[in-house]
Interface confidence: low
């Protein structure tokens, strides 16, 4: 029977800069029941606080609700593992909420084949930003990426859409069924998961000729 091994805070993520969650990996348990606590202070403060919510994020997590989240402060946090034989501490982790944002996937993905008489046909893709993100404040710039492929193909074709919420694709294989997905990331954060796939059948008369 031994003191617990050193835990590690391995990930912190925020969906929208208003709340965030951190997760840790326990070290070895030393063969005894082990309790974990996460403590933190915000830069500029000496006051140490304990994690406000160990439940919402699941096992080995700490969730910071709105009233505990400030995007203007760096959080300095550590996890303490304790059993009957002693304690061990994780390394301190510095967290800027601004830089850990991982939004939900974009919503309302719509895909349509457009065949204007006087121009080349194209695939028109449109979507909306995730609901939790408030773009009006100017605190967020969301960037978008689209991927698509014929249903039976192995390789995805990827297009960067910048800040646009619609995109046109010209070169497609007639008669194929395509899967289309979109994802987003804030300027300093992480890519969201891909949105659920939308399927579109490209007509056989979809011509790529001039």
């Amino acid at each position: 029977q031994l003191p617990p091994g050193k835990p590690e805070i391995f990930k912190c993520r925020s969906p929208n800069k208003e709340t965030f969650t951190c997760w840790w990996r326990p070290g070895t348990d030393g063969g005894l029941p082990t309790n974990y606590s996460l403590t933190y202070h915000r830069e500029g403060e000496t006051l140490m606080h304990e994690c406000p919510d160990y439940i919402t994020g699941g096992p080995n997590s700490c969730h910071f609700g709105k009233q505990y989240t400030s995007m203007w402060r760096t959080y300095i946090m550590m996890v303490n593992a304790t059993n009957q034989m002693g304690s061990s501490f994780s390394d301190e982790l510095y967290v800027d909420v601004t830089y850990i944002v991982q939004p939900d996937p974009p919503l309302e993905l719509a895909v349509e084949v457009k065949q204007p008489e006087d121009r080349k046909p194209y695939l028109w893709i449109k979507w909306s930003p995730p609901t939790l993100i408030d773009l009006k404040t100017g605190w967020f710039t969301l960037l978008y990426e689209i991927r698509l492929k014929p249903e039976k193909a192995a390789e995805w074709e990827i297009h960067f859409a910048g800040q646009q919420t619609e995109f046109k694709i010209l070169s497609l294989h007639p008669g194929q069924k395509y899967l289309v997905q979109v994802r987003c990331k804030p300027d300093h954060g992480y890519w969201s998961a891909w949105s659920p796939a939308t399927f579109i059948q490209i007509p056989s008369d979809f011509t790529m000729n001039d």
């Epitope: 830069e43 500029g44 403060e45 000496t46 006051l47 510095y94 800027d96 601004t98 300093h188």
Partner: antibody, heavy 118, light 112 residues
């Protein structure tokens, strides 16, 4: 070792502009908040501005808001302060400083003197 | 007017004596839980950090320098003054309502 080397000060007329630079070395520049602090001749220290690590967030003292702009180039390890619409009361030694956790300003540049006079 | 007020403004002390410098803030800075840092500035030089986070000494700072904080007040103590300690000392803290740093007006420490 940590070094902050400043440049860009000088004599300027009221209403004029200057750009101060602070070249950082000896540490991982993009890991730190950075600050500007000034000191008028014979007076105390006055905080001017700070900027977060990846630079979207900035704070300014009320006395310089709308006239001064802090920025940074993490690729060049350099901090800047653009001074516009300068006034006589902006005459001071300007120091750049590195921030750490709890934003302590633990390393300071040697200072660069800005004199606003006609 | 939000400020950090240092007292005394100047003090003259003999080598080997103990000196304390007080820094009084308000509920938006020191009293809000924000830490206090102390800087020493000698003529013609940039300030140097002597105490950070209320009572922590950076490496290389002699242990005669100590700091404490209670409520809206902070104190710098030099337990046995040396000639090289003659300088101006400043306290500093973050202020929430200004969203910026505040410095005290400085305390000039002279050797008798």
């Amino acid at each position: 070792q940590v070094q902050l080397v400043q440049s860009g000060g000088g004599l300027v007329q009221p209403g004029g502009s200057l750009r101060l630079s602070c070249a950082a070395s000896g540490f991982s520049y993009s890991d730190y908040w950075m600050h500007w602090v000034r000191q008028a001749p014979g007076k105390g220290l006055e905080w001017v501005s700070d900027i977060s690590r990846l630079s979207p967030y900035t704070n300014y003292a009320d006395s310089v808001k709308g006239r001064f702009t802090i920025s940074r180039d993490n690729a060049k390890n350099t901090l800047y302060l653009q001074l516009n619409s300068l006034r006589a009361e902006d005459t001071a030694m300007y120091y750049c400083a590195r921030g750490l956790d709890a934003r302590r300003m633990s390393y300071w540049g040697q200072g660069t003197l800005v004199t606003v006079s006609s | 007017d939000i400020q950090l007020t240092q007292s005394p403004s100047s003090v003259s002390v003999s080598v080997g004596e103990r000196v304390t410098i007080d820094c009084t803030g308000s509920s938006s800075n020191i009293g809000h839980g924000y830490v206090v840092h102390w800087y020493q500035q000698k003529p013609g030089q940039a300030p140097q950090l002597k105490i950070y986070r209320n009572n922590q000494r950076p490496s290389g700072v002699p242990d005669r320098f100590s700091g404490s904080k209670s409520g809206t007040d902070a104190t710098l103590t030099i337990s046995s003054l040396q000639a090289e300690d003659a300088a101006v000392y400043y306290c500093a803290a973050w202020d929430d309502s200004l969203n910026g740093w505040l410095f005290g007006q400085g305390t000039k420490l002279e050797i008798k």
